[in-house]
């Protein structure tokens, strides 16, 4: 936001170099995606709705975020799972829930896990149940890297803009 | 921190444009609030204690953070809940715990949930119990927007500076 | 990334002040550490492996991150715990799991908890079990401050680069 809240001399500097702040802003890619609530048995990320956005070069392709420029990014994601009363039948074995942010890079021929959270819930013992998972961290990423997610327990997702999301921003 | 760790030529540039770094810093509002431990049955945010702070325009009014300038912010919050051991009832019903960061904006006439986490805990045989919830994400906010929280299970909060907090910073 | 994606006039500005962007980058310390998987009964942080890194002044000493310059930092950490299946006892006592990020500063003669998460798990009928904890927040730190972690339940850690990590970056 060039010129906002600047002292006169700083505002003058910004006028003399009008593109300086703008250039800096172009180096601040950010994205926030939300899980599509209309897709109940898959997790499809959406950027064009509610509070979701893609800024300064981030794009969404094949359900993956494409990293626009090399640098350090903070990457984060959350999911919320739930189960209704008496959903399991003849088992007391736990339900495995997991959510992972993965990196697919030209440097590696496979998906590298960046962030992983896991939970076993015991539907037979605790019904109804609810569980939230969140994680985020800073990573050195390269232009063209693909960030995606993998989730175990998709049928149990609570899909809303404030419960299931995935994002990243350049530091 | 203008001039720290700069090469001679960069330091010279900073001296020529003395407000440039400062101007950039004034565009970096940040806040970190902690739950007031003296208020046991409410969640009141405090900024003037322990590690809490308000910087570069953030203010706290009516238990809400006021967004000082339009832009993208990373918003986060954590709560920890606990329950003490008691004489359990075998058929005790579940306790619903939830924590939400909400946005009140001039654009909407209601509170919009930004971040939501939820949990069912089953007191009884599982006493004592402890549960932590954390979430955070990037949002496009407008000057004057109000960020607040809503919590289900307030009497069970473990109120300390490192367990219950709420914050935001401009990207 | 000086000159990347800049308009001609902004690129010219960057050439006139060649160190300006670089200087800005030197004020962006960041670190991401992962738990050493070869150490099963301790939590030793590593920076020279997998996706881990230390940048712009951060260093790792005595299992602590040393803050390179005063300012506001976002600090974060995650752990994942697990327990394997065994012949269950319904009355087994709870296991206390906790993870804390602590600050040791010249201003205080003791470790100050910055971020704390806690959980009680009940082995027995709930075996196997898995539990994830994450937290992060913004703090005003001083050059020379030491950031470290304390964990209860270390033998139960799931040590992998994507499950157990600790990091910080300057805002």
């Amino acid at each position: 936001l060039p010129g906002v809240g600047l002292t006169p001399s700083a505002a003058q500097t910004a006028r003399q170099h009008p593109k300086m702040h703008l250039a800096h802003s172009t180096l601040k890619p950010a994205a926030h995606l939300i899980g599509d609530p209309s897709k109940q048995n898959s997790l499809l990320w959406r950027a064009n709705t509610d509070r979701a956005f893609l800024q300064d070069g981030f794009s969404l392709s094949n359900n993956s975020l494409l990293v626009p420029t090399s640098g350090i990014y903070f990457v984060y994601s959350q999911v919320v799972f739930s189960g209704k009363a008496y959903s399991p039948k003849a088992t007391s074995s736990p339900l495995y829930l997991a959510h992972e942010v993965q990196l697919f890079s030209s440097q590696y021929p496979f998906h590298v896990p960046l962030l992983s959270s896991q939970k076993m819930v015991y539907p037979g013992l605790q019904e109804p149940w609810l569980h939230s998972m969140y994680h985020g961290a800073a990573f050195q990423l390269t232009q063209g890297d693909q960030l995606s997610t993998h989730t175990d327990g998709i049928p149990h997702l609570v899909l809303s803009p404030s419960t299931v999301f995935f994002g990243a921003f350049a530091l | 921190l203008p001039g720290v760790g700069l090469t001679p030529s960069a330091a010279q540039t900073a001296r020529q444009h003395p407000k440039m770094h400062l101007a950039h810093s004034t565009l970096k509002p940040a806040a970190h609030l902690i739950g007031d431990p003296s208020k046991q049955n409410s969640l009141l945010w405090r900024a003037n204690t322990d590690r809490a702070f308000l910087q570069d325009g953030f203010s706290l009014s009516n238990n809400s953070l006021l967004v000082p300038t339009s832009g993208i912010y990373f918003v986060y919050s954590q709560v920890v809940f606990s329950g003490k051991a008691y004489s359990p009832k075998a058929t005790s019903s579940p306790l619903y715990l939830a924590h939400e960061v909400q946005l009140f904006s001039s654009q909407y006439p209601f509170h919009v949930p930004l971040l939501s986490s939820q949990k069912m805990v089953y007191p009884g045989l599982q006493e004592p119990w402890l549960h932590s919830m954390y979430h955070g994400a990037a949002f496009q906010l407008t000057q004057g927007d109000q960020l607040s929280t809503h919590t289900d299970g307030i009497p069970h909060l473990v109120l300390s500076p490192s367990t219950v907090f709420f914050g935001a910073f401009a990207l | 990334l000086p000159g990347v994606g800049l308009t001609p006039s902004a690129a010219q500005t960057a050439r006139q002040h060649p160190k300006m962007h670089l200087a800005h980058s030197t004020l962006k310390p960041a670190a991401h550490l992962i738990g050493d998987p070869s150490k099963q009964n301790s939590l030793l942080w590593r920076a020279n492996t997998d996706r881990a890194f230390l940048q712009d002044g951060f260093s790792l000493s005595n299992n602590s991150l040393l803050v390179p310059t005063s300012g506001i930092y976002f600090v974060y950490s995650q752990v994942v715990f697990s327990g394997k299946a065994y012949s269950p006892k319904a009355t087994s006592s709870p296991l206390y799991l906790a993870h804390e990020v602590q600050l040791f500063s010249s201003q205080y003669p003791f470790h100050v908890p910055l971020l704390s998460s806690q959980k009680m798990v009940y082995p027995g009928l709930q075996e196997p079990w898995l539990h994830s904890m994450y937290h992060g927040a913004a703090f005003q730190l001083t050059q020379g401050d030491q950031l470290s972690t304390h964990t209860d339940g270390i033998p139960h850690l799931v040590l992998s680069p994507s499950t157990v990590f600790f990091g910080a970056f300057a805002l």
């Epitope: 959903s87 039948k89 074995s93 013992l125 175990d152 327990g153 | - | 012949s87």
Partner: antibody, heavy 114, light 113 residues
């Protein structure tokens, strides 16, 4: 439609090994445990153990520990049972089941004989 | 291991009869926190896989006729067929899923009289 389909049964020499497959379709595979149950001819049902495909967690009946190994390939929605050092008394129909939803496969017959 | 004992081992009955099969466990299958019994009943016909009839001791699986009912708690459980039909002649098994290893009763064969 949900289906569990076992394969890999047949005649095996004593001391030999078998690898049974259980292909799942019609539901999300990774979060739910796959149980293995066997039934000797004219006898009752015996629980061998179970695997969680997503986490890789396994639980074995002590009777089969060391001889049975469970694995899973999430990309193929398939669970596997490997049994070693087979004896005549291992002759049985082997079933895979998902107790969470109450699904069972049709079973595959393994005959251990020389 | 939890031992499951069914009785009788076999029984002969006619179409329309009320049939009762019992199952006893060597320890309680009741989880007191939620008052659920970790017991299931299966029906198996010759050459076929077992079919789930009842879970949580008394909950009928979808598609199972209402003439099948389960009852009991703790260590004593009963499967009742209120009016035996021709397609009900089969072997019935109880199973506990309270603890590992999961264990089955030895089975009760229901034959035509």
């Amino acid at each position: 439609e949900v289906q569990l389909v076992e394969s890999g049964g047949g005649l095996v020499q004593p001391g030999g090994s078998l690898r049974l497959s259980c292909a799942a379709s019609g539901y999300t595979f990774s979060s739910y445990w796959i149980e293995w149950v066997r039934q000797a001819p004219g006898k009752g049902l015996e629980w061998v153990g179970e695997i969680n495909p997503g986490s890789g967690s396994t639980i074995y009946n002590e009777k089969f520990k060391g001889r049975a190994t469970f694995s899973a390939d999430n990309s193929k929605n398939t669970a596997y049972l490997q049994m070693n050092s087979l004896r005549a008394e291992d002759t049985a129909v082997y079933y895979c089941a998902d107790g969470y939803h109450g699904y069972w496969g049709q079973g595959t017959l393994v005959t251990v004989s020389s | 291991d939890i031992q499951m004992t069914q009785s009788p081992s076999s029984l002969s009955a006619s179409v329309g009869d009320r049939v009762t099969i019992t199952c006893k466990s060597s320890q309680s299958l009741l989880y007191s926190t939620n008052q659920k019994n970790f017991l299931a009943w299966y029906q198996q016909k010759p050459g076929k896989a077992p079919k789930l009839l009842i879970y949580w001791a008394s909950t009928r699986d979808s598609g199972v006729p209402s003439r099948f009912s389960g009852s009991g708690s703790g260590t004593d459980f009963t499967l009742t067929i209120s009016s035996l039909q021709p397609e009900d002649f089969a072997t019935y098994y109880c199973q506990q899923y309270y603890s590992y290893p999961r264990t089955f009763g030895q089975g009760t064969k229901v034959e035509i009289k």
